[in-house]
Amino acid sequence: ARNGDHCPLGPGRCCRLHTVRASLEDLGWADWVLSPREVQVTMCIGACPSQFRAANMHAQIKTSLHRLKPDTVPAPCCVPASYNPMVLIQKTDTGVSLQTYDDLLAKDCHCI
Amino acid sequence: ARNGDHCPLGPGRCCRLHTVRASLEDLGWADWVLSPREVQVTMCIGACPSQFRAANMHAQIKTSLHRLKPDTVPAPCCVPASYNPMVLIQKTDTGVSLQTYDDLLAKDCHCI
């Protein structure tokens, strides 16, 4: 079925939201971010088998062409469909400031 | 450099727009599309090395975490940043109809 949510590869193997714990050092942010000290990064990881969570017509085309020309056309890729905002306390020239980043944490995922 | 357009892997190896010629049969559209008979499908293909065409903060995080945990976190993926519309002449219950698809042909690409 188009845009299906059933993973034919087995539970948890297909494109879905994962959480990865990362320190400011891991992210390369230690020199400009004060808080939070650790981030639960939500990201989209997993395989995109035929029509699984296909984002749009382009993803459906990509699936078809990947099946025909796997060496030329890659399979669709698991990427964020939307994001949650995150507020950082960051260093500025004048001190510190709150800054909202709208594109930092994945909220849900699809294949494209 | 962040969001850089220089490909460190060599010309044409990094995320960019490619054109793949496909017939209606290739796309699985022969039973519902009358025209065009052949589509020049523009799609995003190529590697996403560190910070190359990083779409947003999430892509930058993904690059950092992939470097640290390559078995857990995949590298960013080359996907459409925007689309060109395409008009299909398609079969309907009552005959034929023109239909515009806004999400069919990639216009430009980024890494996410």
Epitope: L34, S35, P36, R37, M86, I89, T94, G95, V96, L98 | -
Partner: antibody, heavy 121, light 110 residues
Framework: EVQLLESGGGLVQPGGSLRLSCAVS????????MTWVRQAPGKGLEWIGI???????YYASWAKGRFTISKDSSKNTVYLQMNSLRAEDTAVYFC???????????????WGQGTLVTVSS | DIVMTQSPATLSVSPGERATLSCQAS??????LAWFQQKPGQPPRLLIY???TLASGIPARFSGSGSGTEFTLTISSLQSEDFAVYYC????????????FGQGTKVEIK
Amino acid sequence: EVQLLESGGGLVQPGGSLRLSCAVSGFSLSSYDMTWVRQAPGKGLEWIGIISGSGSTYYASWAKGRFTISKDSSKNTVYLQMNSLRAEDTAVYFCARGILVYADYGDHNLWGQGTLVTVSS
Amino acid sequence: DIVMTQSPATLSVSPGERATLSCQASEDIYTNLAWFQQKPGQPPRLLIYAASTLASGIPARFSGSGSGTEFTLTISSLQSEDFAVYYCLGVYTYISAEGAFGQGTKVEIK
């Protein structure tokens, strides 16, 4: 000299609205976050919210919906718009520079003297 | 919502003695914490920021410690001018940002 001066306080009836101003001098509002804090008579301090240098706003959950922080950088003024006022909103309202839990470079302690808002019929 | 809880509500101490004030956060706020002193009719005065950094012009008898959810303000040897109300302020950031003061600790002469 760096200064903050609140104004706009006074007597207002329950259900009414009031806009407080915090005029700043000696620094640019585009470079600093600004915090509003209030204190009811004989009570403790209460954090209301912040407007960042870039203009993003953050509020205490109890203030969301009724209180709005804004600024006019050209007038060097931060505002606190208060709607649907209740007797329990009676307090001295302070503005302060920065997010307070981390000091700005330079002056570490910059608060206005406060303006009294009384909500009563 | 972040909640900051201070204890004790009142602390009776003799001049020259040590005073220890506690502040607990309902969320992990890392070091996003400040301590303020307030006297009647005055705005609050910043003593400690980033949980443990002494603000400029503040005597070294004041010190702060802690991280995460548990914080302490210590006044090593109370002077007469130190009798006042002390507040902690925490700021929690993640998907949004919110601050909250503790209810205050009154340090009075024993």
